[in-house]
C-alpha cells in the first residue's frame, strides 16, 4: 500500500535569465528511493539513481545542474521554460510517486514589478 506523499514547491515563478531550484520531498513512507526522474512534460531532464548517481539528459546539460539533494537547478531561464515539471520517485516496495511543479518564467521587468508568486 502506498502511504507516502510528495511535497513540492508548487507553483513558482522566476525571471528570464535567472535560475530556479525545483524541489520535491517524499514523506510518510519507509519506502527506499531507487531513482528520481525529473521530467518536463514528456521530456527527460535528469536522473538521480541510488547506485549510479546523477545523469543530466544531453539536451539540457548546459542549463541544468543536479541538486541540491534530489532537487534540480534550472539555469539561464527562458520564457520557453514555462510549464509543468514532474519529479518521479521510483521506490521499493511502494512503487512510483509523482510530484508536479508549475514554473512561470517572467520577463525581468514584469518580475521586478511584483508579479512573482508562490503557491505552496
Amino acid at each position: 500500500m502506498m502511504t507516502g506523499t510528495i511535497e513540492t514547491t508548487g507553483n513558482i515563478s522566476a525571471e528570464k535569465g535567472g535560475s530556479i531550484i525545483l524541489q520535491c520531498h517524499l514523506s510518510s513512507t519507509t519506502a527506499q528511493v531507487t531513482q528520481v526522474n525529473w521530467e518536463q512534460q514528456d521530456q527527460l531532464l535528469a536522473i538521480c539513481n541510488a547506485d549510479l548517481g546523477w545523469h543530466i539528459s544531453p539536451s539540457f546539460k548546459d542549463r541544468v545542474a543536479p541538486g541540491p539533494g534530489l532537487g534540480l537547478t534550472l539555469q539561464s531561464l527562458t520564457v520557453n521554460d514555462t510549464g509543468e515539471y514532474f519529479c518521479i520517485y521510483h521506490t521499493y516496495p511502494d512503487g512510483t510517486y509523482t510530484g508536479r511543479i508549475f514554473l512561470e518564467v517572467l520577463e525581468s521587468s514584469v518580475a521586478e514589478h511584483g508579479a512573482r508568486f508562490q503557491i505552496p
Epitope: T34, Q35, N37, L44, I47, N49, D51, L52, G53, H55, S57, P58, H90, Y92, P93
Partner: antibody, heavy 120, light 116 residues
Framework: EVQLLESGGGLVQPGGSLRLSCAAS????????MSWVRQAPGKGLEWVSL????????YYADSVKGRFTISRDNSKNTLYLQMNSLRAEDTAVYYC?????????????WGQGTTVTVSS | QSVLTQPSSASGTPGQRVAISCSGT????????VSWYKYVSWYQQLPGTA?????????QRPSGVPDRFSGSQSGTSASLAISGLQSEDEAHYYC???????????FGGGTKLTVL
C-alpha cells in the same frame, strides 16, 4: 522503432582479441544504461558487463574482469565490448541490451546477437 | 556469488495455467536489503531468437506483452505465471535480478516450457 544491431563477431584463436559493436537507434542513447549479455551454445544467459550513461561507471562479471572492456560513444550511438585474452569458454552469442529507464528494473530491448567462436 | 534457481523444465496443455518459480539468495531479492536488490525481471527466449522482456520491476508488463503473463514476488522467491497457455508460449524463460552488493546482474538457469 527502437533497435540494437550488434556486429564484430567471428572466429578467433585462444589468446586473441575481438571488438564487438552495437549500433543503437530509435531512442536517446545517452539516457540509458547498457549491458552486454552472452549465451554459450546450448546454455543459459550470462550477464557480461554494464555501463552507465556517460561511460564513467562500468561493472563486469568475474569471468571476464581484467580481460573485457565495455565502452560507449554517445556521439555515434554505439556501444562496444573489447575482448582480449579470449578463451574457449568465451564462445557464445553476444547480445547488447538497453536497460529500462530505472536500470535495476531489467533490460527492455535486445539486439539480435553476434556470434563469437574461440577455437584453434 | 548469488544464485537464482529455476526449475529446468515445466509443461502444460493449451489453456492451462503454469507458474515458473525463481528463488534467490537473500542479497538479490529479499526485502531486508536496500531497494536495488529487489527488482526481478523475466525474459522469454523463443528458439533461435534473442531474449524478450516479459516482466520488469517484479510485476510490471511492458506494452505489447499479453496480460496472460504476470509476475509476483515474495521474500526470496519470484514467480512468472502464464495463463491460457498457447503453443507459441513454448520457449525458455529466464528470471534475472540486479545484485547490488556485487554490482552485477544475475540470471536464473532458465526453464524450458513445453506445451503438450
Amino acid at each position: 522503432e527502437v533497435q540494437l544491431l550488434e556486429s564484430g563477431g567471428g572466429l578467433v584463436q585462444p589468446g586473441g582479441s575481438l571488438r564487438l559493436s552495437c549500433a543503437a537507434s530509435g531512442f536517446t542513447f545517452d539516457d540509458y544504461v547498457m549491458s552486454w549479455v552472452r549465451q554459450a551454445p546450448g546454455k543459459g544467459l550470462e550477464w557480461v558487463s554494464l555501463i552507465n550513461w556517460s561511460g564513467g561507471t562500468t561493472y563486469y562479471a568475474d569471468s571476464v574482469k581484467g580481460r573485457f572492456t565495455i565502452s560507449r560513444d554517445n556521439s555515434k550511438n554505439t556501444l562496444y565490448l573489447q575482448m582480449n585474452s579470449l578463451r574457449a569458454e568465451d564462445t557464445a552469442v553476444y547480445y547488447c541490451a538497453k536497460h529500462w529507464i530505472v536500470y535495476q528494473y531489467g533490460m527492455d530491448v535486445w539486439g539480435q546477437g553476434t556470434t563469437v567462436t574461440v577455437s584453434s | 556469488q548469488s544464485v537464482l534457481t529455476q526449475p529446468s523444465s515445466a509443461s502444460g496443455t493449451p489453456g492451462q495455467r503454469v507458474a515458473i518459480s525463481c528463488s534467490g539468495t537473500i542479497s538479490n531479492i529479499e526485502t531486508k536489503y536496500v531497494s536495488w536488490y529487489k527488482y526481478v525481471s523475466w525474459y522469454q527466449q523463443l528458439p533461435g531468437t534473442a531474449p524478450k522482456l516479459l516482466i520488469y520491476n517484479n510485476v510490471q508488463r511492458p506494452s505489447g506483452v499479453p496480460d496472460r503473463f504476470s509476475g509476483s514476488q515474495s521474500g526470496t522467491s519470484a514467480s512468472l505465471a502464464i495463463s491460457g497457455l498457447q503453443s507459441e508460449d513454448e520457449a525458455h524463460y529466464y528470471c534475472a535480478s540486479w545484485e547490488g552488493g556485487l554490482n552485477s546482474w544475475v540470471f536464473g538457469g532458465g526453464t524450458k516450457l513445453t506445451v503438450l
